[in-house]
């Protein structure tokens, strides 16, 4: 728990607990904000960010988008709070330890956003989840 | 057990440099990926910066990047926070604190063993 030395401030963000009174952690997360980036057509990817940084909030997580265009390729890695919207989208998937990418409807371009709560989880970004056991391929594997 | 106490605080003119220690008792010091936090008057904690205790990966917040390295002596049990170019706005208590070894570092483990923290007043 939070020691009697260390002051708690009313309304202060900076300092979350959870149930039992023990400080949260901040999220360590890629971030390298918008990037041109070769991946494309694959089932996962690297960030090919060298850049970990404490997320500025415990209740922080990491975010990854990908967006591709006529143009171009870019991948973005923030930390951003799962509260707020990003890029107009509600972070669903905030508690997962893995970057599922999604596909969102935005006109003009392919957009992917993933979002996960494990240190450095927005470094391997996954179109295709392999082991989602409701893939029937793999129960067929499983059970043979 | 593991106990923390900080040292190396004081006063400091804008631009200047200090290095703040933590030394840890305790034969566990090892097994813990290390912080500095602070907490400026008034307002909330800010961590600032952490190191791993193998290979002593470290990790920044953008506020003090390139300003500050972490450091750790595992034979000595010390945590170090060298502090340079430093601003009126790194005005704060400094605290150093353990994160216990959970599942890939549990984010919800208590802070159990706090120092009573080091003053660093940036002013001139």
């Known amino acids: 728990t939070i020691p009697p030395h260390v002051q708690k401030s009313v309304n202060n963000d900076m300092i979350v607990t959870d149930n039992n009174g023990a400080v949260k952690f901040p999220q360590l997360c890629k971030f390298c904000d918008v990037r041109f980036s070769t991946c494309d057509n694959q089932k996962s990817c690297m960030s090919n960010c060298s850049i970990t940084s404490i997320c500025e909030k415990p209740q922080e997580v990491c975010v990854a988008v990908w967006r591709k265009n006529d143009e171009n390729i870019t991948l973005e890695t923030v930390c951003h709070d799962p509260k707020l919207p990003y890029h107009d989208f509600i972070l669903e998937d905030a508690a997962s330890p893995k970057c599922i990418m999604k596909e969102k409807k935005k006109p003009g371009e392919t957009f992917f956003m993933c979002s996960c709560s494990s240190d450095e989880c927005n470094d391997n970004i996954i179109f295709s989840e392999e082991y989602n056991t409701s893939n029937p391929d793999l129960l067929l594997v499983i059970f043979q | 057990e593991v106990q923390l106490l900080e040292s190396g605080g004081g006063l400091v003119q804008p631009g200047g440099s200090l290095r703040l220690s933590c030394a840890a008792s305790?034969?566990?010091?090892?097994?813990?990926r290390m912080w500095w936090v602070r907490q400026a008057p008034g307002k909330g904690l800010e961590w600032v910066s952490a190191i791993e205790p193998i290979g002593h990966r470290t990790y920044y917040a953008n506020s003090v990047k390139g300003r500050f390295t972490i450091s750790r002596d595992n034979s000595k049990n010390t945590l170090y926070l060298q502090m340079n170019s430093l601003r009126a706005e790194d005005t704060a208590v400094y605290y150093c604190?353990?994160?216990?070894?959970?599942?890939?570092?549990?984010?919800?483990?208590?802070?159990?063993?706090w120092g009573q923290g080091t003053l660093v007043t940036v002013s001139s």
């Open positions: 305790g034969s566990t010091f090892t097994e813990y």
């Open positions: 604190a353990k994160q216990a070894p959970g599942e890939k570092w549990a984010r919800r483990w208590d802070l159990d063993y």
